[in-house]
């Protein structure tokens, strides 16, 4: 066959769907690879062809669109399963072509099983709610296009295994779940089950997401450097190991990049000739506030090193701060015999 622009296996779009539920999968060509949409392609005389490779097989085969009750069908650039079966798992390819043009991409589709409490190997999206922030809501995701607006589905929300009913601060409102107050106790997995009729059959869509309650932007502060501080002096003799921790607290801020770095005499450690190593550790509070510690280490410090300026810097979306460490050379204890001798005028 003639040459075809092959975008390969698009593993970035690992699609997971639940067994025995409807699934609509758009051909990724139009979403991520081509500069035109399906309508333009169709009106230009291009045809969209679907085929697949079963799990643990190498053979590409056409998709059977003649199954009972049209279990698998294609509509424009969408491949429909009504519903999926476990053995639909595999790599699916959509190819757009005519006599002079060809472009194709493959993507993995995994049909997963869930238990009665909605546990499954499905990768869950995370929705962050601000702690004690006021009314916030989550919306049942990825249900658009499954039924027309004239169809009124029933939606049931669950937290973990339990149906949300008289949950005090959590109120189901159709496709939305409203949190009157978001508390740490609201952390967990929330599932919406959308039930709708189609051609005399009833279908269910199950969507689970993880809610994580995080620090409120109203409480956010610039980075706070706990160490170094004015109370600790790093007093060393030449040849000893110098260890200076820089410990910084960062309030949680959505999409903020938290940075900590050291400068030695105003330069980054990489730009200086001394043998310095820096080790970083990060810990998080329950509301995702972050504490970063960078330990600056010089194995065998010289008297020159002890005269340098060591400054810890921190930056977040809330601001930038810096703090110098107090480093000094330890004054050796007087050697008694010599001092005594000097005292008597001996040479």
């Amino acid at each position: 066959s003639e040459r075809c622009d092959d975008w390969g296996l698009d593993t970035m779009r690992q699609i997971q769907v639940f067994e025995d539920e409807p699934a609509r999968i758009k051909c990724p060509l139009f979403e991520h690879f081509l500069k035109f949409n399906y309508s333009t392609a169709h009106s230009a005389g291009l045809t969209l062809i679907w085929y697949w490779t079963r799990q643990d097989r190498d053979l590409e085969e056409p998709i059977n669109f003649r199954l009972p009750e049209n279990r698998i069908s294609k509509e424009k650039d969408v491949l429909w399963f009504r519903p999926t079966l476990l053995n639909d798992t595999g790599n699916y390819t959509c190819m757009l072509r005519n006599t002079t043009y060809c472009s194709k991409v493959a993507f993995p589709l995994e049909v997963v099983q869930k238990d009665s409490c909605f546990n499954s190997p499905m990768k869950l999206p995370v929705h962050k709610l601000y702690i004690e922030y006021g009314i916030q809501r989550i919306t049942c995701p990825n249900v658009d296009g499954y039924f027309p607006s004239s169809v009124k589905p029933t939606i049931t929300w669950y937290m973990g295994c339990y149906k949300i009913q008289n949950f005090n601060n959590v109120i189901p409102e159709g496709m939305n779940l409203s949190f009157l107050i978001a508390l740490i106790s609201n952390n967990g997995n929330y599932t919406c089950v959308v039930t709708y009729p189609e051609n005399g059959r009833t279908f269910h869509l199950t969507r689970t997401l993880t809610v994580k309650v995080v620090g409120s932007p109203k409480n956010a502060v610039p980075p706070v450097i706990h160490s170094p501080n004015d109370h600790v002096v790093y007093e060393k003799e030449p040849g000893e190991e110098l260890l200076i921790p820089c410990t910084v607290y960062f309030s949680f801020l959505m999409d903020s990049r938290n940075e900590v770095w050291w400068t030695i005499d105003g330069k980054k450690p990489d730009d200086i000739t001394i043998d310095v190593t820096i080790n970083e550790s990060i810990s998080h509070s329950r509301t995702e506030d972050e504490t970063r510690t960078q330990i600056l280490s010089i194995k065998k410090v010289t008297s020159e090193d002890l005269k340098r300026s060591y400054v810890c810097h921190a930056r977040s979306a809330k601001g930038e701060v810096a703090k110098a460490a107090k480093v000094k050379q330890k004054v050796p204890a007087p050697r008694y015999t010599v001092e005594l001798a000097c005292g008597f005028g001996a040479t």
Epitope: E132, Y133, G134, N169, I171, P172, S178, L180, I181, S216
Partner: antibody, heavy 119, light 110 residues
Amino acid sequence: SLEESGGDLVKPGASLTLTCTASGFSFSSTYYMCWVRQAPGKGLEWIACIYAGSSGSTYYASWAKGRFTISKTSSTTVTLQMTSLTAADTATYFCARVDGSSSGSWDLWGPGTLVTVSS
Amino acid sequence: AIEMTQTPSSVSAAVGGTVTINCQASQNIYSNLAWYQQKPGQRPKLLIYAASLLASGVPSRFKGNGSGTEYTLTISDLESADAATYYCQGAVYSGNTEWAFGGGTEVVVK
């Protein structure tokens, strides 16, 4: 309990600030504080609510936006600032507490304060 | 904005009787509905919240029901102390958060 104050007889076009003071409890992240009014012989009308937590998120009836401002001034007081008052604003103004940990129930109301707008 | 329509505007019944008050929301309010009792010159008193939950200290003669856009308050075994105006109140938290009250129903006990 809740107690409203600041109600007065004012002229059209004037401004007025009402205060709601809580006693026996202090505003916490569990509560929303709201203002509702009732014109003489008429029904209840929601004006605005404020979240008592640190964010102080505010919620207004569409007709109240711009002319009414709800604020939390301390851990036990909420105010309602009203501007460009007209005779239609003559009413008893109630302060109410909404319990966010109890399905949003409006469980505590003040006795109300009367605002009269007349020339 | 949500609108709450309450019917009837007035209802009369004998002591020991039953009255039913209806409240219709202009959109689905998902059981975010409360009922209040107000006597002349007094503050409103919460009776029912979340459509059917009885507020603390309220006798079980008061019963709330309904879902979606249609809700009812039923008062059985009427007592003379039940003479008051009753208001429904709906809330919507998703989208633009708002609350709205019905126009009120006057209950006269004969």
